[in-house]
């Protein structure tokens, strides 16, 4: 029988390569049974995850899963970093794996490094 616990399906060690100036939607896939949980996004700062209070978010409902979306309109260079979603369910806090955004500044897009280069050399992101 399928578990009725809330589950957050951000893939472990997932990464996204995005351009500053573009719109972007970061999805947190959420599985729940009856009542939709309260879900929030935070951005990692060292070992602390800082809650993103004043950011545009929305829900997208599909047949077997829902998505809690963090909107970047547009992506800014300082959006670079790792994000996590978390859900409150029956007074338990459920945390997702973190997902990392590698933001390339549009000014340097002509010499844009490869995705793999960005993953292995994150200082490229701050040029």
């Amino acid at each position: 029988k399928e578990s009725c616990d809330v589950q957050l399906y951000i893939k472990r060690q997932s990464e996204h390569s995005i351009l500053a100036g573009d719109p972007f939607e970061l999805e947190c896939p959420v599985k729940y049974c009856a009542n939709r949980p309260h879900v929030t996004w935070c951005k990692l700062n060292g070992t602390t995850c800082v809650k993103l209070e004043d950011r545009q978010t929305s829900w997208k409902e599909e047949k077997n899963i829902s998505f809690f979306i963090l909107h970047f309109e547009p992506v800014l260079p300082n959006d670079n970093g790792s994000y996590r979603c978390s859900a409150n369910f029956q007074s338990n806090l459920i945390e997702s794996h973190s997902t990392t955004l590698y933001v390339t500044d549009v000014k340097s897009a002509s010499e844009r490094p490869s995705k793999d280069e960005m993953a292995s050399r994150p200082w490229l992101l701050y040029r």
Partner: antibody, heavy 120, light 112 residues
Framework: QVQLQESGPGLVKPSGTLSLTCADS????????IHWVRQPPGKGLEWIGR????????RYNPSLKSRVTISSDKSKNQASLKLSSVTAADTAVYYC?????????????WGQGTTVTVSS | DIVMTQSPDSLALSLGERATINCKSS???????????LNWFQQKPGQPPKRLIY???KLDSGVPDRFSGSGSGTDFTLTISSVQAEDVAVYYC?????????FGQGTKLEIK
């Protein structure tokens, strides 16, 4: 049941490009990661790299990175491997494997493997 | 890169004997999420690897309970409590914590 199947030419000329495809008939590839692993004759397993088919983000083995490209086609539910400037040392059985995702994240399903020989 | 070193390279045992294969990683495999992504694979001639154990000690479905895994940090062990003829294979450890992913060099198990 997850079924992965590698396909591609069994013979590649030295300095040419090896091209293989991995078709996944049992799972939506965007929900997981697809890895490529190779095994030279009589030797051990070597991880080549992986792709997140949801967004195309790749990770490669640094020892092969300058020559390897992994891509995916969500509409065909398949991933591809290209290895350029091949030599006899690239002769191996090439496997694709699926990472099983939440909550275990390990290589749970493998293709049968396809043998690629580099020879003129 | 994380180097995975298995020992021994090969072992020959009689049926019913206990097999112990060790795997040592050059760095801790404990991930930020508190899990240790250390896996064991079995490969028989002409076949792809088959996952036996994941997350150090969890047995894959259908794997006989004579197989077990243990360890933490950098030191891991695969144990076969009573070796059977069908266990003849090469066994590999694999780490899924760090990039690049890496395998041990393999341990060949034979029957005396």
């Amino acid at each position: 049941q997850v079924q992965l199947q590698e396909s591609g030419p069994g013979l590649v000329k030295p300095s040419g490009t090896l091209s293989l495809t991995c078709a996944d008939s049992g799972f939506n590839i965007k929900d997981t990661y697809i890895h490529w692993v190779r095994q030279p004759p009589g030797k051990g397993l070597e991880w080549i790299g992986r792709i997140d088919p949801a967004n195309g983000f790749t990770r490669y083995n640094p020892s092969l990175k300058s020559r390897v490209t992994i891509s995916s086609d969500k509409s065909k539910n398949q991933a591809s491997l290209k290895l350029s400037s091949v030599t006899a040392a690239d002769t191996a059985v090439y496997y694709c494997a699926r990472e099983d995702g939440y909550p275990y994240y390990t290589l749970d399903s493998w293709g049968q493997g396809t043998t690629v020989t580099v020879s003129s | 890169d994380i180097v995975m070193t298995q020992s021994p390279d090969s072992l020959a045992l009689s049926l019913g004997e206990r097999a112990t294969i060790n795997c040592k990683s050059s760095q801790s495999l404990l991930d930020v999420d508190g899990k240790t992504y250390l896996n064991w694979f079995q490969q028989k001639p002409g076949q792809p690897p088959k996952r036996l154990i994941y997350l150090v000690s969890k047995l894959d479905s259908g794997v006989p309970d004579r197989f077990s895994g243990s360890g933490s940090g950098t030191d891991f062990t695969l144990t076969i409590s009573s070796v059977q003829a069908e266990d003849v294979a090469v066994y590999y450890c694999w780490q899924g914590t760090h990039f690049p992913r890496t395998f041990g060099q393999g341990t060949k198990l034979e029957i005396k």
